[in-house]
C-alpha cells in the first residue's frame, strides 16, 4: 500500500523555539516515521532538517538549526515505513515574520501602596529579537484578587511601578511584550500575584514640582509631618527603557541629600539637556518612607516653561489681567516658542473658594467681582502640545482691591 504524504503542516515559532506540527494522513498505518528537509532561498538542494528526522510523533523541534531569521526557507515532509510517501511541500516562510514573542519573565516587589514590576524577555539573548531587543515595550493587566476588575496599562518598559494601591491587599497581574516596529504582540506571561505590605508609618512625599529661579532649579514637594529630612534622587529616563538592563542606578543631587525643608535648590548645570526621573524620600531618623511617585523632568521644557508674569488693572466689578513673557535673571524676557494656554486662579482674600479661568489669550477679564474687595490671583502656563503636556508652576499670588462701585473705567 502506498504511503500518503502527511498534511496540514503548521510552523509555530515562539522566540527562538521552532516547532513543527502535522497530521497523519493515514491513522490506520502503524509504525510510521516522518522526516523533514529544508531549503534556503537561492539554493537548489534540500538539506535534512536536524531534530526532525525519523520522528514517530506528529511534532518536532528544530530550534537547534542556526538559521538567518530574516531569510526565507522552505520545508518538505514525507512519511516513511518500508517505503516512503511523496514529499509534501510547506509554503515558504521567513522565520522572523512568523515568529511570536513569548511570555516575558516577571518579578514583583511589594510596597504598602505600590508594586514594582521587573520585566525581562522570556528568552535571554534571543537570536530572533537580537536586533529588536531595545524596542520591546510591555503591557499588563492588573486586578485585585478579591474583585477581579481588570485595569490595563499599555506601553511600559522593563521596570514599572504601579501606585495608589491599597495596603495588605493581594493584586494579580499578567504581562505581554510587543514589538511595535514589527507590529508584533506577544503572549501573556503566567499570572503573578503579590500582597502589598502593611501601611508604612511614614507616607511618601507628594506633589513634586520643579521650577526655575535664576540659574537654579527649585524642587518642591508636600509632606504630612514636620521635623523630617528628605533626600532626592535622579535617573536618566532612557535607562528605564533598556530591557534586561540592571543599570538602574538612582543618583543623588548634591544639594538635596539631607534637606530639612520640603524644597531644595540646585544649579541648572547639574543636569545636561535631557529627560530625567526624580523621586523624593522622607526620614525621621528612625523610619524611612517609601519613595515618592517618580516625576518626569525635561530640562528643555522645564528650563523655559516659567510661570507667566502678569499685570492687573482693577475695576469695580472685574479685573483685567495682561499676561507677559516671564523674566529670567537680568530681567530679560523668555521667548517661549511653543503655543501656551494660561490657567488663572482667583479667590477672595478672606475665603478659600477658588475660581478658575482657562484662556489662550494674553489679556483676560475676570468678571463678577465685588467692589472694594481684595482678590488674589495666580497663574500658570501649560503647553498646548499633547506630546509635551507640561505645566509651569504657579506664579506668586498677586492681591488687588477692586474699585468702588459704578467705576466703569
Amino acid at each position: 500500500k502506498n504511503l500518503k504524504s502527511p498534511q496540514k503542516v503548521e510552523v509555530d515559532i515562539i522566540d527562538d523555539n521552532f516547532i513543527l506540527r502535522w497530521n497523519r494522513s493515514d491513522e490506520s498505518v502503524g509504525n510510521v516515521t516522518f522526516s523533514f528537509d529544508y531549503q534556503k532561498t537561492g539554493m537548489d538542494n534540500w538539506i535534512k532538517l536536524s531534530g526532525c528526522q525519523n520522528i514517530t510523533s506528529t511534532k518536532c523541534n528544530f530550534s537547534s538549526l542556526k538559521l538567518n531569521v530574516y531569510e526565507e526557507i522552505k520545508l518538505r515532509i514525507r512519511a516513511e515505513k518500508e517505503n516512503t510517501s511523496s514529499w509534501y511541500e510547506v509554503d515558504s516562510f521567513t522565520p522572523f515574520r512568523k515568529a511570536q514573542i513569548g511570555p516575558p519573565e516577571v518579578h514583583l516587589e511589594a510596597e504598602d501602596k505600590a508594586i514594582v514590576i521587573h520585566i525581562s524577555p522570556g528568552t535571554k539573548d534571543s537570536v530572533m529579537w537580537a536586533l529588536d531587543g531595545l524596542s520591546f515595550t510591555y503591557s499588563l493587566v492588573i486586578w485585585k484578587n478579591s474583585s477581579g476588575v481588570e485595569e490595563r496599562i499599555e506601553n511600559i518598559y522593563s521596570r514599572h511601578k504601579i501606585y495608589k494601591l491599597s495596603p495588605e491587599t493581594t493584586y494579580c497581574l499578567k504581562v505581554k511584550a510587543a514589538l511595535l516596529t514589527s507590529w508584533k504582540i506577544g503572549v501573556y506571561s503566567p499570572v503573578h500575584c503579590i500582597k502589598t505590605t502593611v501601611e508604612n508609618e511614614l507616607p511618601p512625599p507628594e506633589n513634586i514640582e520643579v521650577s526655575v529661579q535664576n540659574q537654579n532649579y527649585v524642587l518642591k514637594w508636600d509632606y504630612t509631618y514636620a521635623n523630617m529630612t528628605f533626600q532626592v534622587q535622579w535617573l536618566h529616563a532612557f535607562l528605564k527603557r533598556n530591557p534586561g538592563n540592571h543599570l538602574y542606578k538612582w543618583k543623588q543631587i548634591p544639594d538635596c541629600e539631607n534637606v530639612k525643608t520640603t524644597q531644595c535648590v540646585f544649579p541648572q548645570n547639574v543636569f545636561q539637556k535631557g529627560i530625567y526621573l526624580l523621586r523624593v524620600q522622607a526620614s525621621d531618623g528612625n523610619n524611612t518612607s517609601f519613595w515618592s511617585e517618580e516625576i518626569k523632568f525635561d530640562t528643555e521644557i522645564q528650563a523655559f516653561l516659567l510661570p507667566p508674569v502678569f499685570n492687573i488693572r482693577s475695576l469695580s466689578d472685574s479685573f483685567h489681567i495682561y499676561i507677559g513673557a516671564p523674566k529670567q535673571s537680568g530681567n530679560t524676557p523668555v521667548i517661549q516658542d511653543y503655543p501656551l494656554i494660561y490657567e488663572i486662579i482667583f479667590w477672595e482674600n478672606t475665603s478659600n473658594a477658588e475660581r478658575k479661568i482657562i484662556e489662550k489669550k494674553t489679556d483676560v477679564t475676570v468678571p463678577n467681582l465685588k467692589p472694594l474687595t481684595v482678590y488674589c490671583v495666580k497663574a500658570r502656563a501649560h503647553t498646548m502640545d499633547e506630546k509635551l503636556n507640561k505645566s509651569s508652576v504657579f506664579s506668586d499670588a498677586v492681591c488687588e482691591k477692586t474699585k468702588p462701585g459704578n467705576t466703569s473705567k
Epitope: L134, H236, F238, N242, H246, K249, Q252, P254, V270, Q272
Partner: antibody, heavy 118, light 107 residues
Framework: QVQLQQWGAGLLKPSETLSLTCAVY????????WSWIRQPPGKGLEWIGE???????NYNPSLKSRVTISVDTSKNQFSLNLTSVTAADTAVYYC????????????WGQGTLVTVSS | AIQLTQSPSSLSASVGDRVTITCRAT??????LVWYQQKPGKAPELLIY???GLGSGVPSRFSGSGSGTDFTLTISSLQPEDFATYYC?????????FGQGTKLEIK
C-alpha cells in the same frame, strides 16, 4: 577627599589566581558602586565588574566565569579575584569609584601591574 | 556589548590648535557617554560626563557634544598639559565599555 589604595601580588604563573584589594580612605563606603578596571600594557581600558555595599555585583560577561568581586564593609575594602590566569590577563588593574552624583568614575586607585608569566 | 570606536587612533597637533576627537557607539546610548584623559603611568581622569557636562575642575577649553551614537570631544586651544590619551566610555548598559583610545601627540 576620598583615596583608593590598592595592593596585591604583581607576578603570577599561568593557572594561578589573581587577588587584589582596594581600601577606601577618607570617604563614605555606602551609596557607591566600586569597580575594577584593567589596562593591558599599551592598550585600552576594560571594565571587569562592580560591587555595592550590599554585596550585589555586576560582571563583564567576557570574564564572568573567572571573576569574583567581594566587599569587607568592616574594613572599607573590596577585592578582586580572577582565577586561571593566562598571559592575556597581564595588565595594570585599577580600582575605581562610580560617583553617586552621576554616571562616571570620579576616584581611581593608583593601579597595580600584574604580570602573568611562566 | 556596545562597542565604541574612537577616531582618529592618534593625532599630532600644536599648542593653540583646536582638536576634535569622535566616538561612535554601535547602538543608541542617549547621553550616557563619558570622556577621560590619561597620562602615562597615571589613572584616567574625568573630563566630560553625560556627553556634554564639564567635570569638576576641568578647564573650559574642553567640551563635549552629541547624543545617540555620535559624540565629539573638542579642545578649543591645546595647552602643553593636554598631550595625553583620551578615552570615551559608555554607561548606558552592562558591560560598561571604553573606546580604544586616541593618543594626542605634539607635532
Amino acid at each position: 577627599q576620598v583615596q583608593l589604595q590598592q595592593w596585591g601580588a604583581g607576578l603570577l604563573k599561568p593557572s594561578e589566581t589573581l587577588s587584589l584589594t582596594c581600601a577606601v580612605y577618607g570617604g563614605s563606603f555606602s551609596n557607591y558602586y566600586w569597580s575594577w578596571i584593567r589596562q593591558p600594557p599599551g592598550k585600552g581600558l576594560e571594565w571587569i565588574g562592580e560591587i555595592i555595599l550590599s554585596g550585589s555585583t555586576n560582571y563583564n560577561p567576557s570574564l564572568k566565569s573567572r571573576v569574583t568581586i567581594s566587599v569587607d564593609t568592616s574594613k572599607n575594602q573590596f577585592s578582586l579575584n580572577l582565577t586561571s590566569v593566562t598571559a592575556a590577563d597581564t595588565a595594570v588593574y585599577y580600582c575605581a569609584r562610580e560617583s553617586k552624583w552621576g554616571y562616571y568614575f570620579d576616584s581611581w586607585g593608583q593601579g597595580t601591574l600584574v604580570t602573568v608569566s611562566s | 556589548a556596545i562597542q565604541l570606536t574612537q577616531s582618529p587612533s592618534s593625532l599630532s597637533a600644536s599648542v593653540g590648535d583646536r582638536v576634535t576627537i569622535t566616538c561612535r557607539a554601535t547602538q543608541d546610548i542617549s547621553i550616557a557617554l563619558v570622556w577621560y584623559q590619561q597620562k602615562p603611568g597615571k589613572a584616567p581622569e574625568l573630563l566630560i560626563y553625560d556627553a556634554s557636562g564639564l567635570g569638576s575642575g576641568v578647564p573650559s577649553r574642553f567640551s563635549g557634544s552629541g547624543s545617540g551614537t555620535d559624540f565629539t570631544l573638542t579642545i578649543s586651544s591645546l595647552q602643553p598639559e593636554d598631550f595625553a590619551t583620551y578615552y570615551c566610555q559608555q554607561f548606558n548598559s552592562y558591560p560598561y565599555t571604553f573606546g580604544q583610545g586616541t593618543k594626542l601627540e605634539i607635532k
